[in-house]
């Protein structure tokens, strides 16, 4: 059985068949006949009852209100009422794009990784018995596929597969021809399999500082979207009011990975901040990577080889 219309806000395109199905629909045949009502309210009118007398485009079933077809003036709030049960929806009917085979505002976007399995199946379970034929279009050019009832694409994705795929179902109702369009915007991206996250730069960094001044320790990593980057310092983080972790910054790389940066700001550097480890860690399901920073007084830097300094 077709699932009920549970979304409270719905956008549809003018001129297409459309239905609302309430969510108190009993699959078992009811023993007694129940009086049911559908209402519409819009800016100008309050609660107008919907039935075939109020509009010849309306058809009613046990659980469903059908529009043959839905039109711009059907925009409004809809209510289903039965005994003490009420359900409400807000319907927005948008104008059809007459210069294209689809309406941009009614597009579902999907991202597919190159070389991964890519599938488009044209199905419409509710109107299935009424559908005469279905066509699949790519960027509004008809694809010649064997099955004209449920055209399907099943393949490993290539970059050339990117585009707008429109399933158009043609159906007859009461001697009139209608169509229902479902469009997918398919974007093909590079392989997004997880990388082992890595912190950028040397594992140990000595930073020359002056007492009473401020320093910003920048920790950068290349990581996956779900990986985390954090600072560890002292016996318990947050005990030093002069140390602040800044907000993490992330930029997506062209390969679909993330470049993350997290700054530890130490203000009014004191003796207690010197010669202790400030550790930055990146953690993922595949493990962790850590790099360390040690603050040293500028006067003492002659004792340390120049190449280990981070300026």
């Amino acid at each position: 059985a077709e699932s009920c219309t549970s979304r409270p806000h719905i956008t549809v395109v003018e001129g297409e068949p459309f239905y609302l199905k309430h969510c108190s629909c009993s699959l078992a045949h009811e023993i007694e006949t129940t009086t049911k009502s559908w209402y519409k309210s819009s800016g100008s009118q309050e609660h107008v009852e919907l039935n075939p007398r109020s509009s010849s485009r309306i058809a009613l079933h046990d659980c469903v209100l059908e529009f043959w077809p839905v039109e711009l003036n059907d925009t409004g709030s809809y209510f289903f009422q039965m005994k003490n049960y009420t359900q409400k929806w807000k319907l927005n009917v948008i104008r059809r794009n007459k210069h294209s085979c689809f309406t941009e505002r009614q597009v579902t976007s999907k991202i597919v990784e190159v070389k991964k399995f890519f599938q488009i199946t044209c199905e419409n379970s509710y109107y299935q018995t009424l559908v005469n034929s279905t066509s699949l279009y790519k960027n509004c050019k008809k694809l010649l596929l064997e099955n004209n009832k449920n055209p399907t694409i099943k393949k490993n994705a290539e970059f050339e597969d990117q585009g707008y795929y429109s399933c158009v179902h043609f159906l007859h109702h009461n001697g009139k021809l209608f169509n229902i369009t479902k469009t997918f915007n398919i974007t093909i991206v590079e392989d997004r399999s997880n990388i082992v996250p890595v912190l950028l730069g040397p594992k140990l960094n000595h930073v020359a500082v002056e007492l009473g001044k401020n320093v910003r320790l920048n920790c950068s990593a290349l990581l996956n979207e779900e990986d985390v980057i954090y600072w560890m310092f002292g016996e318990e983080n947050g005990s030093d009011p002069n140390i602040h972790e800044e907000k993490e910054m992330r930029i997506m790389t062209p390969e679909g990975k993330w470049h993350a940066s997290k700054v530890l700001r130490i203000e009014n550097i004191g003796e207690s901040n010197l010669n202790v480890l400030y550790n930055c860690t990146v953690a993922s399901t595949g493990g962790t990577d850590t790099k360390s920073f040690i603050l040293v007084r500028k006067a003492d830097m002659a004792d340390i080889p120049g190449h280990v300094f981070t300026r």
Epitope: S26, P52, A59, L60, C63, N174
Partner: nanobody, 123 residues
Amino acid sequence: DVQLQESGGGLVQAGGSLRLSCAASGFTLGAYAINWFQQAPGKERARAWVLCITSSGGSAYYVDSVKGRFTVSRDNAKNTVYLQMNSLKPEDTAFYYCAAGGACAAAETMNYWGKGTLVTVSS
């Protein structure tokens, strides 16, 4: 021969009751939603939808003007639908037609029609 036949119409005083029947022959009534339409005598206007019972018998829909006064029911074993009309008003005077269709819907979508029965309510 496939047909629908209404019966039970007649003359009744305002406030009175009538029970109309819609019997099918040559096809299974239980496969269809049964709609009732009214047409005022002498008016060649389109038949106006009044009420309907779904094929399952689980749902009934009524136009506001008859809600609480008219009740529809069906007996699929007898291939018949009944329309109980109570608290009748002079404005209910009309020819009543039953029609079988795929849904509770407009007249032009109906598959089978009866020939109609006249209900006259006098004041």
